[in-house]
Amino acid sequence: SGTTNTVAAYNLTWKSTNFKTILEWEPKPVNQVYTVQISTKSGDWKSKCFYTTDTECDLTDEIVKDVKQTYLARVFSYPAGNVESTGSAGEPLYENSPEFTPYLETNLGQPTIQSFEQVGTKVNVTVEDERTLVRRNNTFLSLRDVFGKDLIYTLYYWKSSSSGKKTAKTNTNEFLIDVDKGENYCFSVQAVIPSRTVNRKSTDSPVECMGQEKGEFREI
């Protein structure tokens, strides 16, 4: 149902990385505009992206209020230039999104190795603690602040001269690993949320190797 010149949105999809969260949908509008509403299961609907010709809406500001809540969005379709017009049932056409729980579903962004420091036969590798748009007491929380020990980093490391890899893990942002003296090593890290069943792992970080800019070597 609805007016003859509007079509309902479809393929409503959540795109979310490190809590930056955008709702996308189809189709590209022809003579129509969209408004998005978002709500928690028990809350009131809040309108966003009023009368837009875009097919996406940034809902980050809403979901970061409580990342453990489950959210539902809906996309309303209106005739362009006549947004008061409604469908035959007396309200505009709309389509519901799938439910979305940010804490469980946001993708983990590609991590970055912040630094590594060699002291004798030990190397300390530090992973950058990425800032999210989640706020507490007016400050932005890092990924570690949000997930705590529910966030693990896996380190892959190998001698530059060989292909055999080793791995280590940490539920902080630092690794302390043993290395052979006089050998250069390369490093890559991956983030993991062990408690999840989907979207558990990030992509690997860019590879960083000793003897390049990021590291520091100290002979003890």
Partner: antibody
């Protein structure tokens, strides 16, 4: 429900090769790290190595590096262990296991391999 | 590589006894230690993870403690169904290593 089923074990002559499979159901292997562990008759558990099926990263105990190869076919949701140049001391039950990063939460039932002439 | 020294290799105890098994790592494994129970012909079963956390569905008579290099597994009151071999596993860094195992028998 989550299940891991190993297959491909059997009797093989020393020096020959064998390929074990581990078919997963109830989850996608690419979402987890996957491991192979073995246990010789009357002996303890021995870790062989792991794979991240999503990117193909593999890690081995150095004693198996070069002779054993772990791979995965994500489209078939199956893990493999290719064992070359087999020796009598490789006789064991071979298990695959799923790793949630804090623990191995699911194991297969094991597949026995006997290396004997 | 990290070595795990598990002791004792076997022990005999009575129903209701308190049983303790230890694992010592050759270096700090930062609590990345699990305890598994294995019965003959079966795959290992997770009991304790991250040194002290009880796995889902595992009876509360099982517990774990420790940090750094020294870890302890305890059965507070031994039951007949606890007859099995118990293994520790460190997974903080590769190669992952198991303890040698402790075979538990009832007297």
């Amino acid at each position: 429900q989550v299940q891991l089923v190993e297959s491909g074990g059997g009797v093989v002559q020393p020096g020959r090769s064998l390929r074990l499979s581990c078919k997963a159901s109830g989850f996608n292997i690419k979402d987890y790290y996957m491991h192979w562990v073995r246990q010789a008759p009357g002996k303890g558990l021995e870790w062989i190595g792991l794979i991240d099926p999503e990117n193909g990263n593999t890690i081995y105990d150095p004693k198996f590096q070069g002779r054993f190869t772990i791979s995965a076919d994500n489209s078939k949701n199956t893990l493999f262990l290719q064992m070359d140049s087999l020796r009598p001391e490789d006789t064991a039950v071979y298990y695959c296991a799923r790793d949630n990063s804090y623990y191995f939460d699911y194991w297969g039932q094991g597949t026995p391999v006997t290396v004997s002439s | 590589d990290i070595q795990m020294t598990q002791s004792p290799s076997s022990l005999s105890a009575s129903v209701g006894d308190r049983v303790t098994i230890t694992c010592k790592a050759s270096q700090d494994i930062r609590k990345y230690l699990n305890w598994y129970q294995q019965k003959p012909g079966k795959a290992p079963k997770l009991l304790i993870y991250y040194a002290t956390s009880l796995a889902d569905g595992v009876p509360s008579r099982f517990s774990g403690s420790g940090s750094g290099t020294d870890y302890t597994f305890t059965i507070s009151s031994l039951q007949p169904e606890d007859i099995a071999t118990y293994y520790c596993l460190q997974h903080g860094e590769s190669p992952y290593t198991f303890g040698q195992g402790t075979k538990l028998e009832i007297t």
